[in-house]
């Protein structure tokens, strides 16, 4: 049938906040560029059926399935999904093509399946078939990138075996230290797998997909830099590739570099050299030491020597399993209300950890910084002076680590009171934990100085709200105090706070708060 229209099917992904089920209309949302679904006539099908490429959608994502029909005259249409008919409102675009849309907001399992669009034009009838499924993110992985030498070329290939396929980029920096932070103007990013320019100061490769971003730094010894006070250490797991770059700059080409492992020269095929002249006509040489798949016997001191520079070494440690080394004993801190303070955890780990800080069931992003001694540190300063229990959790492919912190904020007590027919209770969250006194106000003691000692029950640290201790004191009612005003006072080294309660028959109780410094 050669009178068939030319049709185009597209998928539009939306960034939206709305929630609803399928709407067969155009819906105003921020959209990404349409993806052609390659709708093509199904061969030899009974009736005229066009079929679109399978559509995989993330849970809760919003999409539009759109059909553009290049056919003369009017068209009418009907969507069918799981034997239910859905309304269809075609319209015409500026090129006079018929446009039919199906919006799926907040994708759920119930919205996955086959969407059939029946179109009737003046010339013919036809069906368009869309298969929509939820993307199985359980199969997703994001693996740390590693390096391989490109065959027959002096270049490195960056590989990350991840699903979905990640975008791989090289992150290059020619400055030192802080200026090589990710968003610094000194940092250059190249979105490609192969890198030929291997002379830079700092070279990292990063891979990113829907799960996030993982980076690997090219371990470098720079013979022109003053050696670190502690020997640099590189950890690898059995089977992983080893790459160490030795770099040296000299006024002319009259120098050479060599690698040794435990005072034995590396075998040929385990190193390659590159050299170039820099802008000021000095010679830069780099010598790579590499092992495509390390074994336990590749552990040791790798020393890079030069005929014109002092040699430098790195300790390479090959482990069977990843690890996280840190002290997991819980730590308690006591700070003033306006004192600057950060929690910190110092650890040594391989592979690099993923971590979170948690307080009050809420997770906070975790930043980690490498120290010169091979350790890393993670700090958390965003506690907003809220007392309680803070948890640091770290994990990598092979190990997990949790550390608890308690933060106490020194402040004078604040008292809350409640009363029933048989007792009155006062609560305070001040720190240090307060002590309690109860006083009776009467004609004899208008200033409420008459102390009550009987029927008082103090419970220190009664309930723990996300690690925040609350102290309470309860007064059991007796005939002697019924109908009187009583005052409960909580005091610690920072001050005193009181609350006055009228003990009468059951009913609403008036509370009068006193703050006594």
């Amino acid at each position: 049938n050669q009178d068939l229209p030319v049709i185009k099917c597209v998928l539009i992904n939306h960034k939206n906040n709305d929630s609803s089920v399928g709407k067969s209309s155009s819906y105003p949302m921020v959209s990404e560029s349409p993806e052609d679904l390659g709708c093509a006539l199904r061969p030899q099908s009974s009736g005229t059926v066009y079929e679109a490429a399978a559509v995989e959608v993330d849970v809760s994502a919003s999409i539009t399935l759109q059909v553009l029909v290049d056919a003369p005259g009017n068209i009418s249409c009907l969507w069918v999904f799981k034997h239910s008919s859905l309304n269809c409102q075609p319209h015409f675009d500026l090129q006079n093509r018929g446009v039919v849309s199906m919006v799926i907001l907040k994708m759920t399992e119930t919205q996955a399946g086959e969407y059939l669009l029946f179109i009737q034009s003046e010339a013919t009838n036809y069906t368009i078939l869309f298969t929509v499924s939820i993307r199985n993110t359980l199969l997703y992985t994001l693996r740390r990138p590693y390096f391989r030498k490109m065959e027959n070329q002096d270049a490195l290939v960056c590989i990350s075996e991840s699903v979905p396929e990640p975008i791989v980029e090289w992150v290059l920096c020619d400055s030192q230290g802080e200026s090589c932070k990710e968003e610094s103007p000194a940092v250059v990013k190249k979105e490609e797998k192969v890198l030929h320019e291997l002379f830079g100061t700092d070279i990292r490769c990063c891979a990113r997909n829907e799960l996030g971003r993982e980076c690997t730094r090219l371990f470098t010894i720079d013979l022109n830099q003053t050696p670190q006070t502690t020997l640099p250490q590189l950890f690898l797991k059995v089977g992983e590739p080893l790459w160490i770059r030795c770099k040296a700059v000299h006024v002319n080409h009259g120098f050479g570099l060599t690698w040794e492992l435990e005072n034995k020269a590396l075998e040929e095929g385990n190193y390659f050299e590159m050299s170039t002249y820099s802008t000021n006509r000095t010679m830069i040489r780099i010598l790579f030491a590499f092992v495509s798949s390390v074994a336990r016997n590749d552990t040791g001191y790798y020393t890079c020597s030069s005929s014109k520079h002092p040699s430098q070494s790195a300790l390479v440690t090959i482990v069977e399993k990843g690890f996280i080394n840190a002290t997991n004993s819980s730590e308690d801190y006591e700070i003033d209300q306006y004192e600057e303070f950060c929690f910190s955890v110092r650890f040594k780990a391989y592979p690099q950890i993923r971590c979170t800080w948690t307080f009050s069931r809420k997770s906070f992003p975790c930043e980690q910084k490498g120290l010169d001694n091979g350790y890393s540190i993670s700090k958390f300063c965003n506690h907003k002076h809220q007392p309680g229990e803070y948890i640091f959790h770290a994990e990598n492919d092979d190990a997990q680590f949790t550390k608890m912190f308690t933060l106490n904020i020194r402040r004078k007590p604040q008292v809350l009171a409640e009363a029933s027919a048989s007792q009155a209770s006062c609560f305070s969250d001040g720190y240090p934990l307060p002590s309690w006194t109860w006083k009776k106000c009467s004609d004899k003691s208008p200033n409420c100085t008459e102390e009550i000692t009987e029927g008082v029950w103090n419970r220190k640290a009664n309930r723990k709200v996300f690690g925040q201790w609350v102290s309470s004191s309860t007064l059991n009612m007796s005939e002697a105090i019924k109908g009187f005003l009583v005052k409960c006072c909580a005091y610690n080294s920072l001050g005193t706070s009181c609350e006055t309660i009228l003990l009468n028959s059951p009913g609403p109780f008036p509370f009068i708060q006193d703050n006594i410094s």
């Epitope: 093509a40 006539l41 199904r42 061969p43 079929e51 399978a54 396929e165």
Partner: antibody, heavy 120, light 107 residues
């Protein structure tokens, strides 16, 4: 990254049998139609057979009907081609190809191929 | 079966030239046509589908046109990496059939 890896090729005598397998990765196998396409040495491409994403519908070229069977196991992520009563003219590199759509009739990804030689 | 005939069977052109390869179907196939590129020793690669839709990642110098029985693949400015054999394929009806191929070389 979409990858298709064929296996099972080899040398077989006329009248013999072979079973080709194709292991896909990097995509949701059960969403795509799959096919086998062959290429005799120094010759052009020849479609052999296709199978729908769900496995229900299969299609064959006339010269292999009754001798070849295409099948898939979506739980194992594998495509198969069972070839019986092989003839000399079946000698070719057999490519596993992913269809762009659930029925799969034009092909956006191809495997590296596996060589089938039918000779006495 | 629908026969697909490509012409020419081979051609030689210079870098920068505009190159055209044609494919004729023995009966009308609407727009059910794909074009593939196969470099020496490599596997086929999809270039065009639905006669004129460029597959993602394919350089824009490639384009397809035609409908019914006559189809064309055009390379607007030939590059050295375009040396390959080009195949058309119809998917209007089973059995799916390919053209015999056009071998493209650089002068």
């Amino acid at each position: 990254e979409v990858q298709l890896l064929e296996s099972g090729g080899g040398l077989v005598q006329p009248g013999g049998s072979l079973r080709l397998s194709c292991a896909p990765s990097g995509f949701t196998f059960s969403n795509y139609g799959m096919a086998w396409v062959r290429q005799a040495p120094g010759k052009g491409l020849e479609w052999v057979s296709s199978i729908h994403s769900g496995g229900g519908d299969t299609y064959y070229r006339d010269s292999v009907k009754g001798r070849f069977t295409i099948s898939r196991d979506n739980s194992k992520n594998t495509l198969y081609l069972q070839m019986n009563s092989l003839r000399a003219e079946d000698t070719a590199v057999y490519y596993c190809a992913r269809g762009r759509t659930p029925t799969g009739y034009y092909f956006d990804h191809w495997g590296q191929g596996t060589m089938v030689t039918v000779s006495s | 079966d629908i026969q697909m005939t490509q012409s020419p069977s081979s051609l030689s052109a210079s870098v920068g030239d505009r190159v055209t390869i044609t494919c004729r179907a023995s009966e009308g196939i609407h727009n059910g046509l794909a074009w593939y590129q196969q470099k020496p020793g490599k596997v086929p690669k999809l270039l065009i589908y639905n006669a004129n839709s460029l597959h993602s990642g394919v350089p824009s110098r490639f384009s397809g046109s035609g409908s019914g029985t006559d189809f064309t693949l055009t390379i607007s400015s030939l590059q050295p990496e375009d040396v390959a054999t080009y195949f058309c394929q119809q998917y209007y009806d089973y059995p799916l059939t390919f053209g015999q191929g056009t071998k493209l070389e650089i002068k």
